[in-house]
Interface confidence: low
């Protein structure tokens, strides 16, 4: 089901708007994939759940409210304040954990962006031309990454020399979309939490 369009207040924490757009875009893309790939295992029950960010980022730990994380780390996150250059924070002074949380989200988005772009390049070679990634979803990922980061980093596309297996690619697309939707929900909750704090 499509999520309702939220119209943010002009003064709202800027990344909340982007995260709402992201959640809506990935939900729409997942719905489209389920419908288009109806004869593929693409439902939440059928797929193997895989987290491409595992061991690379710590978004869930870093983004828990500070009250929950204060005893989690051997380093005291409350004693030291930090400033990042990410535009989502505007000129806010923020705790290290908040900066780390936003950085972890950025890293997640970057990893998914690489995977999605690589996958889209393969899907474009499919003679059936059955499904492609929604350009709006890719654009929304890009927008949120830019909002999180003043100094834009170029995201490399992974090159693949072997002949793509389109069946496997479509199954992987479903796996990635399911995982990314869960991450998008987390990101949206974090941004809502930061907007409220």
């Amino acid at each position: 089901r499509n999520l309702p369009v939220a119209t943010p207040d002009p003064g709202m924490f800027p990344c909340l708007h982007h995260s709402q757009n992201l959640l809506r875009a990935v939900s729409n893309m997942l719905q489209k994939a389920r419908q288009t790939l109806e004869f593929y295992p693409c439902t939440s029950e059928e797929i193997d759940h895989e987290d491409i960010t595992k061991d690379k980022t710590s978004t869930v730990e870093a983004c828990l409210p500070l009250e929950l994380t204060k005893n989690e780390s051997c380093l005291n996150s409350r004693e030291t304040s930090f400033i990042t250059n990410g535009s989502c924070l505007a000129s806010r002074k923020t705790s290290f954990m908040m900066a780390l949380c936003l950085s972890s989200i950025y890293e997640d988005l970057k990893m998914y962006q690489v995977e999605f772009k690589t996958m889209n390049a393969k899907l474009l070679m499919d003679p059936k031309r059955q499904i492609f990634l929604d350009q709006n979803m890719l654009a929304v990922i890009d927008e949120l990454m830019q909002a999180l980061n003043f100094n834009s980093e170029t995201v490399p596309q992974k090159s693949s020399l072997e002949e793509p297996d389109f069946y496997k690619t479509k199954i992987k697309l479903c796996i990635l979309l399911h995982a990314f939707r869960i991450r998008a929900v987390t990101i949206d909750r974090v941004m809502s939490y930061l907007n409220a704090s």
Epitope: K56, A62, T84, L100, S104, E107, N149, F150, E153
Partner: nanobody, 118 residues
Amino acid sequence: EVQLVESGGGLVQPGGSLRLSCAASGFTFSSYMMSWVRQAPGKGLEWVSFISSGGGISSYADSVEGRFTISRDNAKNTLYLHMNSLKPEDTAVYYCTKGRGDTRYDYRGQGTQVTVSS
């Protein structure tokens, strides 16, 4: 096997500068955020700074903000910490860490000693 080797520490007078380096190997350096943490004599670990995998996002402790600059060269698999206007309270062993800088999750090097004294 993950290896992080820090260098560049030493004895410096207050107001002086140092550049710490951390040579990384055994993992895809460009895929990970990196951090510097430090441990002053008789104190616990303190986060100093972190930098995102591509170098675009960085963050600093209040105590070093405006004096220290973190950077990285992904082509050389090296992390840096440029330290200016050093103070006696910056005296510590500085460790380079892979990831968020929390020892539950991350590897860290053997450290390099920085002593600020006249």
